[in-house]
């Protein structure tokens, strides 16, 4: 009997505090066999999918979501979810991205490493579909 899918983890490179205009890459990790990783922003209201999935280790796959030039509007909460046919995983914990003005000061590091994994509650919002592609006849918001 197959158990529930393991929760994904999320991390940010080079960290979770990013100077304005710098780049950041969110890294989503899950088990081998993932078809699609989804990076959700602010409680599912927007998301980005990728099927560019690579094997990070014999037991783990990953996908990377890069923002080339971070703007203030990129600040917020992010989390990962994945589709391993025929079902979706639970979400990762949230990771908060902070955007700061470039100070250039030598005393303050530009980034702080950050990652998030483990248990989390499903959101109670019903906004999963808000920016989703047309559902071709299916209503959404009712997950397993």
């Amino acid at each position: 009997q197959e158990e529930d899918l393991p929760r994904p983890s999320i991390s940010a490179e080079p960290g979770t505090v990013i100077p304005l205009g710098s780049h950041v890459t969110f890294v989503c990790r899950g088990p081998v066999g993932v078809q699609t990783f989804r990076l959700e922003r602010d409680s599912r209201s927007t998301y980005n999918d990728t099927e560019d999935v690579s094997q990070a280790s014999p037991s783990e796959s990953e996908a990377r979501f890069r923002i080339d030039s971070v703007r203030e509007g990129n600040a917020g909460l992010y989390r990962c979810i994945y589709y391993k046919p025929p079902k979706w995983s639970e979400q990762s914990d949230y990771l908060e991205l902070l955007v700061k003005e470039s100070s250039g000061g030598p005393d303050s590091p530009d980034t702080e490493p950050g990652s998030s994994a483990g248990p989390t509650q499903r959101p109670s919002d019903n906004s999963h579909n808000e920016h989703a592609p047309a559902s071709q006849g299916l209503k959404a918001e009712h997950l397993y």
Epitope: Q35, D49, P85, P86, Q136, A140, L143, Y144
Partner: antibody, heavy 121, light 107 residues
């Protein structure tokens, strides 16, 4: 609207192969999977396998791993199922069905009209 | 493999009746169950997805319920066009598996 148009009926000799097609329209072909389902006359439905055209990943029932091969052509939005080493047990109607998963759940929602395969010497 | 058991192979009903078709999974499949209607010579038509959600265009006399291992498709105010075969499907795990079907016929 979503449509899955399947190829016409096939009459084949035992031991040969057939290749069935399923042309998709009305949605983005690479955003969904495509399942194939077998139904023998007067019988129930049997899942054969599923392919994800975006990357070609496919999943099969253990029963048909040596019988069926699923492929997809993104340029023509067409999925294919090849059945080989045909026997009378393969005589059936074969349906393709869209496997929709974009909104955070799975649903086999739209079905093709079916292709009848008759294996006879 | 997960076995989906539809214990009633045939069910007799009359126009206007309410009928419930059941499906039992051999293990917990959460709400990953769909219901299909099939008429002779036609392809299956999706009625219910995720145990309780009506597909587009499906009349509201069709209702799905259940989660875990026990699922029910209820047709209230049966119409003559509802006479058909009904199949459940689990999509929690591969291989996807269907119930054997329940044929709804007139008394």
């Amino acid at each position: 609207q979503v449509q899955l148009q399947q190829s016409g009926a096939e009459l084949a000799r035992p031991g040969t192969s057939v290749k069935l097609s399923c042309k998709a329209s009305g949605y983005t072909f690479t955003s969904c999977g495509l399942s194939w389902v077998k139904q023998r006359t007067g019988q129930g439905l049997e899942w054969i396998g599923e392919i994800y055209p975006s990357n070609g990943n496919s999943y099969y029932s253990d029963k048909v791993k040596d019988k069926a091969t699923l492929t997809a052509d993104k340029s023509s939005s067409t999925a294919y199922m090849e059945l080989r080493s045909l026997t009378s047990e393969d005589s059936a109607v074969y349906f393709c069905a869209r496997a929709y998963y974009t909104n955070g759940y799975y649903a086999m929602d739209y079905w093709g009209q079916g292709t009848s395969v008759t294996v006879s010497s | 493999d997960i076995v989906m058991t539809q214990s009633q192979k045939f069910m007799s009903t009359s126009v206007g009746d309410r009928v419930s078709i059941t499906c039992k999974a051999s293990q917990n499949v959460r709400s990953a169950v769909a219901w299909y209607q099939q008429k002779p010579g036609q392809s299956p038509k999706t009625l219910i997805y995720l145990a309780s959600n009506r597909h587009t265009g499906v009349p509201d006399r069709f209702t799905g319920s259940g989660s875990g291992t026990d699922f029910t498709l209820t047709i209230s105010n049966v119409q003559s066009e509802d006479l058909a075969d009904y199949f459940c499907l689990q999509h929690w795990n591969y291989p996807l598996t269907f119930g054997a079907g329940t044929k709804l016929e007139l008394k």
